[in-house]
Interface confidence: low
């Protein structure tokens, strides 16, 4: 529609009491340069006066000077392209609709931007990949819909409450498309990390806790097995009996099949967690292990070397 002014800015901005809000904004007026600008809070059009009513957070005076009482709110733009705003500090009662009343030589426009100010710092949001597999590098992302030049923050990663050793990369966006702070952590989880709690903690510049988000790691891994043998030294005489037991210490997802291998070859019809060898013979000497599979793949126990000696 050629009769409209063109604006680009985030639709909604988020902040909390005492922080600040930086509103990136560009515009193009219908007929050249901007003449005057008023920033309203929750503007309402008054049909009787044909003007907008509402709290004026900022008003550009005719000579471009900013009255000292308006310094909390700053217009950082210009008369032709930029309508960037800063509110520092921002207060809970600033929540609502900001109305940018723009007047050029012959045209007028009211542009609305939503501001959501919470009482306390809101938590970041941890984003995990759809699936995490052991030993495969993944990127953990912590996203906070906040960034402001006048209020530095930091995002810290914790594993079971302990700062993670891996170096995180923090980036910020303060553009007309998006406003956020993001921390990305490259991490190669081990099976032992399954079920552990990862925290992304929002802190102020001094490291003071502001808020956090937590997730429980769901690390897909092959079954982790322990093999036990009786007798424990796995040295027997011909005719003796040997029992091997396979224990699953961890499997995610649940295991589906069990098998036993001797010298790398599967033993037929041995599909339980206990392998009973009765009246062993010399040729049953060798390396035994159990193999348990799940959807990720097979897991093998350590090998037990069974020595069958002559009677």
């Amino acid at each position: 529609d050629s009769s409209k002014w063109v604006f680009e800015h985030p639709e909604t901005l988020y902040a909390w009491e005492g922080a600040c809000v930086w509103i990136p904004c560009t515009y193009r007026a219908l007929d050249g340069d901007l003449e005057s600008f008023i920033l309203f809070h929750n503007p309402e059009y008054n049909k009787n006066t044909s003007k907008f009513d509402g709290t004026r957070l900022y008003e550009s005076t005719k000579d471009g000077k900013v009255p000292s009482e308006q310094k909390r709110v700053q217009f950082l733009g210009d008369k032709n392209k930029n309508c960037t705003l800063s509110i520092h500090p921002v207060h809970l009662n600033d929540s609502g609709q900001l109305g940018l009343r723009m007047e050029s030589k012959t045209e007028k426009w009211m542009e609305r931007i939503h501001l959501n100010v919470s009482e306390r710092p809101f938590p970041p949001h941890i984003q995990l990949p759809p699936e995490i597999q052991e030993s495969q590098e993944v990127t953990l992302t912590c996203l906070l819909n906040f960034s402001c030049y006048g209020y530095p923050i930091q995002l810290q990663w914790l594993l079971e409450g302990v700062p993670m050793r891996q170096a995180a990369v923090t980036s910020t966006s303060l553009t007309i498309k998006s406003v956020f702070t993001r921390s990305e952590l490259k991490f190669s989880p081990q099976w032992s990390h399954h079920g552990k709690i990862v925290t992304c903690q929002l802190q102020d510049a001094d490291g003071k806790f502001l808020s956090n988000d937590t997730v429980q790691l769901n690390v897909k891994h092959t079954p982790k097995l322990e093999i036990k043998v009786t007798p424990s030294d796995a040295i027997v005489r011909e005719g003796d009996s040997v029992t091997m037991t396979c224990e699953v210490s961890s499997s995610n997802p649940e295991y589906t099949t069990v098998s036993w291998l001797k010298d790398g070859t599967s033993l037929k019809k041995q599909n339980t967690f206990t392998l009973n060898l009765r009246e062993v013979t010399k040729d049953q000497s060798g390396k035994y292990c159990c193999q348990v599979s799940n959807d990720v793949g097979p897991g093998r126990s350590e090998e037990v070397f069974l020595q069958v000696q002559y009677a």
Partner: antibody
Framework: EVQLVESGGGLVQPGGSLRLSCAAS????????MNWVRQAPGKGLEWVGR????????NYSGKFKGRFTISADTSKNTAYLQMNSLRAEDTAVYYC?????????????WGQGTLVTVSS | DIQMTQSPSSLSASVGDRVTITCRSS???????????LEWYQQKPGKAPKLLIY???NRFSGVPSRFSGSGSGTDFTLTISSLQPEDFATYYC?????????FGQGTKVEIK
């Protein structure tokens, strides 16, 4: 300190071309209009046109449209005036001038000027 | 295009004199919001112009108080209340209300 420094002037033959440069420093170049103003020897000032370096938008005085082109390189903080099909009457000192206010139109900073002489 | 016509084209005056330069636009440079983008610039030989007054009557930062601007509609005036030695120069009015922007032809203030 905000500074504008022009360069590129000199002697050029009629019909020739010349590109003037205006190097800006001391402020955010991309967020202020940059104007070109010329002054023929012993004559008055004449507005040529302007550019907004942030996105390259331009406005020209009608008499210069087609022959003169204003451009800018924000990575170099430099504005340019490309002049083609030059005539003797284009002989002048060329100034760049920043439009330095958000609300009031005025040229608060000027370069020192660069002389262009069109002669055979 | 809007023509800006200054008068006189030149004048001779002494230090301490009150000097008045007028500028007339060929059409109104007042827009609907009430602002008038009329400026005055001072230029000395071999130097770049310097801003004195913007929006008819606003003195630019650092400009001595002896310089003042007034006017409305199409008629504008630059006044130097008490001419000083450093004020001998050429003065230009300028309109920035409509494209193309235009300067007056200049008024040269010389020593009597």
């Amino acid at each position: 300190e905000v500074q504008l420094v022009e360069s590129g002037g000199g002697l050029v033959q009629p019909g020739g071309s010349l590109r003037l440069s205006c190097a800006a420093s001391g402020y955010e170049f991309s967020r202020s209009w940059m104007n070109w103003v010329r002054q023929a020897p012993g004559k008055g000032l004449e507005w040529v046109g302007r550019i907004y370096p942030g996105d390259g938008d331009t406005n020209y005085s009608g008499k210069f449209k087609g022959r003169f082109t204003i451009s800018a390189d924000t990575s170099k903080n430099t504005a340019y005036l490309q002049m083609n099909s030059l005539r003797a009457e284009d002989t002048a000192v060329y100034y760049c001038a920043r439009d330095g206010s958000s609300w009031d139109w005025y040229f608060d900073v000027w370069g020192q000027g660069t002389l262009v002489t069109v002669s055979s | 295009d809007i023509q800006m016509t200054q008068s006189p084209s030149s004048l001779s005056a002494s230090v301490g004199d009150r000097v008045t330069i007028t500028c007339r636009s060929s059409q109104s440079i007042v827009h609907s919001q009430g602002n008038t983008f009329l400026e005055w610039y001072q230029q000395k030989p071999g130097k770049a112009p310097k801003l004195l007054i913007y929006k008819v009557s606003n003195r630019f930062s650092g400009v001595p108080s002896r310089f003042s601007g007034s006017g409305s509609g199409t008629d504008f005036t630059l006044t130097i209340s008490s001419l000083q030695p450093e004020d001998f120069a050429t003065y230009y009015c300028f309109q920035g209300s409509q494209f193309p922007y235009t300067f007056g032809q200049g008024t040269k203030v010389e020593i009597k």
